[in-house]
């Protein structure tokens, strides 16, 4: 299954399949995760070692048992792959680093005004991996301001050194926020030229692609069909480059598909799997274990469920069935793909589903009326969980913010619902950033059950907390997915890193904003808070947030929305916004509901028909 | 030229049987895979059946199974359609087709055959 | 099986019009979908395959997008030839399905 969890202080010894460098824990975890053979990874800050060749390496480690022995060494961070973790699993990284430079090869250097305007600048250039940015107190005056894009052979530093005054991080492409767009078209019967950067053996030219987009120096294929003339060539997927970025040469040629890497487009990517089953097909590879099933769907699923297979194939042939069962290869190689596609066969093979972003159709959990004033514009798939709840009556307007928790789940106060409980006049937006993008084309959500916390009493500010069941299950995209949830009276965690985001007032008399809003606001002790709110009770079951001298707070339409915590590099969903004096006052913080109180109820409902919990824990 | 060429449709009682062939040329026949559509008077595409290149992996349409069986010949370049126990809703224009290698779509087409059951 | 569901069934149009017709298929199928034009007692053409790739000799004024459930077939201005009935067809699962098709008629 998907585990979470960080240790601190510890490093597996052995099991190494890669090394890199990489500049925090979550990045090297992001490497392993999409590596195919990692499932545990060790890292070293700068901080844990005196050997500057070992500084911020991050070494990718597999096992045959899955897990390795761990020994203690002060500052190392480990942990798993994220692979079989669903929506958590993502290649767009948008941390900025202080203080480090990621080296490189340097191909070209501009003047930029701030670190974003770097980032940006290495999102929309096609060969850009990484960057440097000189600030404007760096020690020498001729290199301030300067952005330097880079890129290396595996699309990481090929080193990180600690550098005053210099910030770094990675291109937002794998975010799905390029600017440059992408060619979605596939040309048959033509070959493309320039400088293969990898070979793999693939069944179809989709899979090609898509190994393309996700392969770090990957901008187009040509992929040879089954019926290629030269038969030791027949289903290989070259991954090319170009100084250019796009192919300088094509050529006719039978059987041949190419295409483009995805990474440029904007909005959407591929999911980093491939789901199609190829019947008639047999993949060959290392043999991992051999398992009697019935179908090939469940041998896709046995597959997917043991996290080191990478590929199967499901026989059809009379001496590898007993009664319905029949041999389920269950296979791998290094490189994530067949080593051998052999076609007329009895067989039907497919590949594993554990990097597939969609996961099951759970919820999230780990397991260790009121807008934003004072906050600032959010940006593009910075908080995809978070949902518009509007109402349509003769006009259509934003009423309160939900968090997405799940396909088909969103979680929100109880008092949105104040008379308005008809779930056929509320229209629920995910995946926006702009109010005023919603046009009567926006695709939307409909409501096909609210359940309101049965203790919930109009006009009380307790248990303001209710779901909402969709009609239909969304799709996780980098722009829609969901928060995970806190684990059952989680008291013990000290979140120092919180935001409340919405579309609420930015004052306490304004107006619902059009862009969404965030701001990072502390969280304050119930005693701190029940001495601001005498006259109310401020309960176990609440917890509040805000800052001592005002100016940062929820407000009206902020209602609903989430306020989400990162503890050790994973958003977590602590609060509903509920309640508050007026918005952003002194001494007065913005109470919510505190969501880890409430787990038990929201695993109760959200059950399925079938008794099956729609949770998942990924640790 | 690939060139695709059904034949073998005509009038059949409901019960009745009668296999439809498909004779393909302008392409080596044993690297794709083929397929039936067929197409009721005034209605929309159906698929039918689809069989792997070397014939070893058939799959049928659930309004077929169990009474259409698909096969080739890869040395006579020829795909059939075997049809048992035919139905009033068999009746259709016939077409076999080609799938292209690597992208699944179907790139080449015969004319197809008329296939009526009646009594 | 998959369903595949295309809208509207029917559209009446004119020359020189900008048309699209939808498809959405009942689970995610990535980008394998291909559309196909067919005139009456003629087999089916080829149009866009892989989504919205063009198959070689079809006019640049056809046009395909979309992936996972929700596609598009565009005829950015129709002309007197384009009149006919469009099928999608999902290749995701080897139980190939189609829409129902959308037939365009003149107005």
């Known amino acids: 299954g998907c585990l979470t969890q960080l240790y601190e202080n510890a490093f597996f010894r052995g099991g190494d399949v890669a090394s890199m460098y990489t500049p925090n824990a979550q990045y090297c975890q992001m490497r392993c995760t999409f590596h195919p053979r990692c499932l545990l990874f060790s890292f070293l800050p700068a901080s844990s070692i005196n050997d500057m060749e070992k500084r911020f390496g991050c070494f990718l480690k597999d096992s045959v048992t899955g897990t390795l022995p761990k020994v203690h060494r002060t500052g190392a961070v480990s942990g798993h792959s994220l692979k079989q973790c669903g929506h958590q699993i993502s290649a767009c990284h948008r941390d900025i680093y202080k203080g480090v430079d990621m080296r490189g090869v340097n191909f070209n250097v501009s003047k930029v005004s701030s670190v974003e305007e770097c980032q940006k600048r290495c999102t929309s250039n096609i060969r850009c991996q990484f960057f440097s940015y000189a600030t404007q107190t760096f020690h020498k005056a001729e290199y301030r301001n300067n952005c330097l894009l880079k890129y290396s052979p595996g699309g990481t530093p090929t080193a990180i050194k600690v550098l005053s005054n210099v910030e770094s991080g990675f291109s937002l492409k794998p975010c799905a926020l390029s600017e440059i767009g992408c060619h979605m078209n596939i040309f048959q019967h033509l070959a493309f030229s320039d400088v293969d950067v990898a070979r793999v053996l693939t069944p179809d030219a989709f899979v090609c692609r898509t190994i393309c987009t996700y392969h770090p120096n990957c901008l187009f294929f040509t992929f040879y069909t089954n019926v290629w003339k030269i038969e030791s060539q027949r289903n290989v997927c070259l991954l090319k480059t170009s100084e250019s970025g796009t192919p300088s040469s094509s050529t006719p040629q039978e059987n041949t598909i190419s295409g483009y890497s995805l990474l440029t487009c904007k909005r959407t990517l591929p999911e980093p799997c491939h789901s199609k089953i190829y019947p008639g097909v047999d993949f060959g590879g290392e043999e991992l274990n051999v398992t009697f099933v019935k179908g090939v769907n469940v041998c896709q699923e046995t597959c997917t469920k043991m996290i080191r297979c990478q590929f199967f194939t499901y026989s059809l042939l009379p001496e590898d069935c007993k009664e319905e069962k029949c041999k389920c290869f269950l296979r791998l190689s290094m490189d994530g793909s067949p080593t051998r596609i052999a076609y007329g066969t009895q067989g039907s093979s497919g590949y594993s589903l554990r990097l597939c972003n969609t996961g099951d159709n759970s919820v999230c959990t780990t397991k260790t009326s009121t807008r934003i004033v004072g906050g600032t514009n959010s940006s593009w798939g910075e908080w995809p969980w978070q949902v518009s709840l509007q109402v349509k009556l003769t006009a259509q307007r934003h009423l309160c913010g939900g968090s997405l928790i799940g396909h088909q789940w969103v979680l929100t106060a109880a008092h949105c619902f104040d008379g308005l409980p008809l779930q056929d006049v509320w229209r629920i937006y995910s995946g926006i950033l702009n109010l005023s993008d919603i046009t009567k084309d926006t695709p939307f959500s409909q409501i096909k059950e609210i359940i309101i916390h049965q203790n919930y009493k109009v006009s009380e500010g307790n248990h303001d907390i209710a779901l909402i069941k969709l009609q239909a299950p969304l799709n996780y995209t980098e722009f829609q997915k969901p928060i995970c949830l806190p684990s059952k009276g989680d008291t013990s965690t000290i979140y120092t890193n919180c935001w409340v985001t919405g579309w609420g007032f930015s004052k306490e008399k304004g107006e619902i904003q059009n862009i969404l809003q965030k701001v990072n606001i502390p969280l304050v002790t119930n005693e701190e808070c029940q001495k601001r709110y005498q006259d109310y009770k401020i309960t176990q079951r609440m917890v509040c947030a805000g800052y001592k001298e005002g100016g940062k707070d929820a407000c009206k339409g902020d209602s609903g929305g989430p306020l989400v915590c990162k503890h050790n590099g994973m958003w977590r969903l602590v609060g509903i916004t509920s309640w508050g004096e007026g918005c952003a006052r002194r001494e007065q913080p913005g109470v919510y509901t505190k969501v880890a109180e409430y787990m038990d109820w929201i695993l109760e409902k959200t059950q399925s028909s079938d008794g099956k919990a729609q949770m998942q824990s990924p640790a | 030229e690939v060139q695709l060429l059904e034949s073998g449709g005509g009038l059949v009682q409901p019960g009745g049987s009668l296999r439809l062939s498909c004779a393909a040329s302008g392409f080596t026949f044993s690297g794709y895979d083929m397929m039936w559509v067929r197409q009721a008077p005034g209605k929309g595409l159906e698929w039918v059946s689809v069989?792997?290149?070397?014939?070893?992996?058939?799959a049928y349409a659930d309004s077929v199974k169990g009474r259409f069986t698909i096969s080739r010949d890869n040395s006579k370049n020829t795909l059939y359609l075997q049809m048992n126990s035919l139905r009033a809703e068999d009746t259709a224009v016939y077409y076999c087709?080609?799938?292209?290698?690597?992208?699944?779509?179907?790139?080449?087409w015969g004319q197809g055959t008329l296939v009526t059951v009646s009594s | 099986d998959i369903q595949m569901t295309q809208s509207p069934s029917s559209l009446s149009a004119s020359v020189g019009d900008r048309v699209t017709i939808t498809c959405r298929a009942s689970q995610s199928i990535s980008s394998y979908l291909n559309w196909y034009q067919q005139k009456p007692g003629k087999a089916p053409k080829l149009l866009i395959y892989?989504?919205?790739s063009l198959q070689s000799g079809v006019p640049s004024r056809f046009s395909g997008s979309g992936s996972g459930t929700d596609f598009t077939l565009t005829i950015s201005s129709l002309q007197p030839e384009d009149f006919a009935t469009y099928y999608c067809q999902q290749s995701y699962s080897t139980r190939y399905t189609f829409g129902q098709g959308t037939k365009l008629e003149i107005k």
């Open positions: 087709a080609r799938e292209s290698s690597g992208l699944y779509y179907f790139d080449y």
């Open positions: 069989i792997s290149s070397s014939g070893g992996n058939t």
């Open positions: 892989a989504a919205s």
